[in-house]
Amino acid sequence: HNTTVFQGVAGQSLQVSCPYDSMKHWGRRKAWCRQLGEKGPCQRVVSTHNLWLLSFLRRWNGSTAITDDTLGGTLTITLRNLQPHDAGLYQCQSLHGSEADTLRKVLVEVLADPLDHRDAGDLWFPGESESFEDAHVEHSISRSLLEGEIPFPPTS
C-alpha cells in the first residue's frame, strides 16, 4: 500500500477519507488504527457501529470520529482539535472475521496554526529537502508519500 499524506492545522479539524470497493467489503465493519512503530501493531482508535447497517452513524472515541458510507464506499475519519501528538502513521481497515484488511495507509501531518505565535518547535514536519513534485494530491490537504520517504519522525 502507498501512504497518503493528510495535512491539518493544529487546533482545527482534519478529515481523512479512505475510498474502497463497497461490494468487496460488503458487510464488513471498518476501523481506524494508529501504527505503533514501523514494524509494530496497529492500535485501534475507533471502529464503526457494531451493526454494519448502522455504519453511517458517527462514532467517537475522544476527539476522533468515524463514519462509513457503505454504499458509496468511503470511510471518513475526523480528527477534531488536531494536536501535534496526533501526527503519525495510521491505517483505515476493513474488518472480516478476526482479521483486518488495510484500505489505506495514512500519514497525518500537523501544521502550525499561522495565527498562533507560540513556539512551533514541538511540531514535526517531514524533511524540508524532500521533493513532492510528483506526489498525487487528492485534496489540498493530502498527497501520496513518495518512495524513500520515511513515514515516521526521526527519533532523537
Epitope: D21, M23, K24, W26, G27, R28, R29, L51, W52, L53, L95, H96, G97, S98, E99
Partner: antibody, heavy 123, light 107 residues
Framework: EVQLVQSGAEVKKPGESLKISCKGS????????IGWVRQMPGKGLEWMGI????????RYSPSFQGQVTISADKSISTAYLQWSSLKASDTAMYYC????????????????WGQGTMVTVSS | EIVLTQSPATLSLSPGERATLSCRAS??????LAWYQQKPGQAPRLLIY???KRATGIPARFSGSGSGTDFTLTISSLEPEDFAVYYC?????????FGGGTKVEIK
C-alpha cells in the same frame, strides 16, 4: 438464475498443465468473492483459496500456495484454477463457490456452488 | 491454522428422530461459522451462516447454535432427504478451514 458453471471433467498425465474454469451468470460477477474447494475421492472438503474478480485480490490456503494459481477474467465472468505440473495426488473433485453478501456478518458463507470439475491424474 | 473437529464421525438415526452434530474449533472463531450439507454426487449446500442463521430456502428443522469454540447443528426431525454428510467451516481466520464432516445415515 444465479449459477456457476464449471468446465468438464479432465484426465491428465503427471507433469502436464491444466486450467479449469468457473463461469458465473445471473449476478454481478465482479461484486462477489469466489472460493475454490477440493474434495479428494471419498474424503472431506478442503479450502484452497479465494479471489475477488473485481480486482483479482487473491488469498491462498498455505497448503495450496505455490501449488495452484487462482485467477479471474472479469470481462467474461470466469474464474480459473490452474496447475503447471500435475501430480497423481491432485486427483479430486474441484468446486468453485460464491461467497454471499450478508448484512452485519463479515464471515464467509458459500451460497452458490458450481457442479464441480473432476480432475483425474494418472500415468 | 484453525482446526475444526466434528463429532460424531457417523450418526445412525431413523427418520423423525432428532440429530445433534457437533463442531469444535481449536481456538475461538466467534460466530464466524457456517454449516453445509452434501449428498452423494452433489455439490455442498449452505445451510447455516453466522453460526445460527438459516440460509435462503433452508427448512426450519435445521438450526445452528454456539459461539467461540463449540457449535451445534440440530435437525429437529429427520426427513428422508436429510441423510447426508454435514460440514462446518470457519471464516474467522484465513485459511477458512472445514471440519472433517459428520455422516448422518439411516439406522
Amino acid at each position: 438464475e444465479v449459477q456457476l458453471v464449471q468446465s468438464g471433467a479432465e484426465v491428465k498425465k503427471p507433469g502436464e498443465s491444466l486450467k479449469i474454469s468457473c463461469k458465473g451468470s445471473g449476478y454481478s460477477f465482479t461484486s462477489y468473492w469466489i472460493g475454490w474447494v477440493r474434495q479428494m475421492p471419498g474424503k472431506g472438503l478442503e479450502w484452497m483459496g479465494i479471489i475477488y474478480p473485481g480486482d483479482s485480490d487473491t488469498r491462498y490456503s498455505p497448503s495450496f500456495q505455490g501449488q495452484v494459481t487462482i485467477s479471474a477474467d472479469k470481462s467474461i465472468s470466469t474464474a480459473y484454477l490452474q496447475w503447471s505440473s500435475l501430480k497423481a495426488s491432485d486427483t479430486a473433485m474441484y468446486y468453485c463457490a460464491r461467497a454471499g453478501h450478508y448484512d452485519d456478518w463479515s464471515g464467509l458463507g458459500l451460497d452458490v456452488w458450481g457442479q464441480g470439475t473432476m480432475v483425474t491424474v494418472s500415468s | 491454522e484453525i482446526v475444526l473437529t466434528q463429532s460424531p464421525a457417523t450418526l445412525s438415526l431413523s427418520p423423525g428422530e432428532r440429530a445433534t452434530l457437533s463442531c469444535r474449533a481449536s481456538q475461538s472463531v466467534s460466530s464466524y461459522l457456517a454449516w453445509y450439507q452434501q449428498k452423494p454426487g452433489q455439490a455442498p449446500r449452505l445451510l447455516i451462516y453466522d453460526a445460527s442463521k438459516r440460509a435462503t430456502g433452508i427448512p426450519a428443522r435445521f438450526s445452528g447454535s454456539g459461539s467461540g469454540t463449540d457449535f451445534t447443528l440440530t435437525i429437529s426431525s429427520l426427513e428422508p432427504e436429510d441423510f447426508a454428510v454435514y460440514y462446518c467451516q470457519q471464516s474467522s481466520v484465513h485459511p477458512y478451514t472445514f471440519g472433517g464432516g459428520t455422516k448422518v445415515e439411516i439406522k
